[in-house]
């Protein structure tokens, strides 16, 4: 079975989590992608998703979460601005690819948000301003209501063969500020 080791990211309140989830360019460029939180004892919950099909370099903002899919680079950029201690938790990037199960991109991210700034002009302190750089044309995409009881699979690294390994059960749901519209038949 695939090991579910987590990548740890430690930030302070008010800072911005800025994560890159890499994918195979040709295969997944236009696929819809999502950012999810995994709470203890619960199925992953979709917090934000790109449009379907996913548009190149087109920011999608849901609350404090901004997704940008760079097709030419083969990466999904996820930003969570103005972090709060309550944002601490386990997150993952996935690719929707119906009728198959979603693919997980890179290792899950264990976000640890602590109180207060370090008082130094560190790498991330001013980056909460990033949200204001997002153009006014920001889209709020509709995330699919995906209820497969089967498994999420990990997308392979670009440099290896296309293999999928079962990870964990998943039930993609929507957060309250995303309109519930079933996209898939």
């Amino acid at each position: 079975a695939t090991k579910l080791t987590e990548e740890k990211y430690e930030l302070k309140e008010g800072q911005t989590l800025d994560v890159k989830c890499d994918y195979t360019l040709e295969k997944f460029a236009s696929s819809q992608k999502a950012w999810q939180i995994i709470r203890d004892g619960e199925m992953p919950k979709t917090l934000a998703c790109t449009e379907r099909p996913s548009k190149n370099s087109h920011p999608v903002q849901v609350g404090r979460i901004i997704l940008e899919d760079y097709h030419d680079h083969g990466l999904l950029r996820v930003r969570m601005v103005n972090l709060q201690v309550e944002d601490s938790g386990l997150y993952q990037c996935v690719i929707y690819q119906p009728p198959k199960e979603p693919h997980m991109l890179f290792d899950r991210i264990r976000l640890v948000v602590t109180k207060g700034f370090s008082g130094t002009p560190g790498s991330n302190e001013n980056s909460t301003q990033n949200v204001y750089k997002i153009p006014p044309t920001t889209t709020k995409a509709l995330c699919p209501l995906y209820t497969s009881p089967r498994t999420v699979t990990q997308a392979p690294p670009k440099s290896t063969a296309d293999v999928s390994t079962p990870d964990s059960e998943i039930n993609l749901t929507n957060v309250t500020d995303i309109i519930r519209v079933p996209v898939f038949n």
Epitope: T2, T5, L11, L17, D18
Partner: antibody, heavy 120, light 107 residues
């Protein structure tokens, strides 16, 4: 304090093999993706390979793909680079590097480096 | 792959000078650019990330700017400790790539 100590470098003939090791301490090794970066004598820096915390996601520079293999043992807090079919142009100081706490793709913590010399 | 081109390759300057190093990417890398300082026989030191964010403990005389394909590292008033080689690095898509380096030497 984050510490990275490389070992395993040395003189090897073209076509030969070497295995580099990097012993990590001062942080939770299993929570960080790790990297190898090299520097040929008198030349610039070149990223060689990256491995995710779980070892599920691995990336290589084109110049080493198919010849080098990156791996890690989280139980031993160790990172490895198996180098096969070595060429003269692989001669370099090899650094083990860790990302910062809040970003991937950056190299904030470095080892002292280990010199690999490929020569007949 | 994204090529990173640094200029100049060597720069002669005096203490107190304002120094500017340029880095160009072969395609847009947004703000995924870092600057490193390296002294002979030592490992590189991360100075700046996200094109302009100073790392903790780095003196404020260092600053970075730019986005897309054009970036600059500026040292507002060169100090004796600043004579070193500087590298830019893009950390957007794999493979991560470095510029060729700029050696800042004493005039």
């Amino acid at each position: 304090e984050v510490q990275l100590v490389e070992s395993g470098g040395g003189l090897v003939k073209p076509g030969g093999s070497l295995r580099l090791s990097c012993a990590a301490s001062g942080f939770t090794f299993s929570s960080y993706s790790m990297n190898w970066v090299r520097q040929a004598p008198g030349k610039g820096l070149e990223w060689v390979s990256s491995i995710s915390s779980s070892s599920n996601y691995i990336y290589y520079a084109d110049s080493v793909k198919g010849r080098f293999t990156i791996s890690r043992d989280n139980a031993k807090n160790s990172l490895y680079l198996q180098m096969n079919s070595l060429k003269a142009e692989d001669t370099a100081v090899y650094y083990c590097a860790r990302r910062p706490d809040d970003r991937r793709g950056l190299f904030q913590h470095w080892g002292q480096g280990t010199l690999v010399t490929v020569s007949s | 792959d994204i090529q990173m081109t640094q200029s100049p390759s060597t720069l002669s300057a005096s203490v107190g000078d304002r120094v500017t190093i340029t880095c160009r990417a072969s395609q847009s890398i947004n703000s995924w650019l870092a600057w490193y300082q390296q002294k002979p026989g030592k490992a590189p030191k991360l100075l700046i990330s996200d094109a302009s964010s100073l790392e903790s403990g780095v003196p404020s005389r260092f600053s970075g700017s730019g986005s897309g394909t054009e970036f600059t590292l500026t040292i507002s008033s060169l100090q004796p400790d600043d004579f070193a080689t500087y590298y830019c690095q893009q950390y957007g898509p794999y493979p991560y790539t470095f510029g060729g380096g700029t050696k800042v030497e004493i005039k």
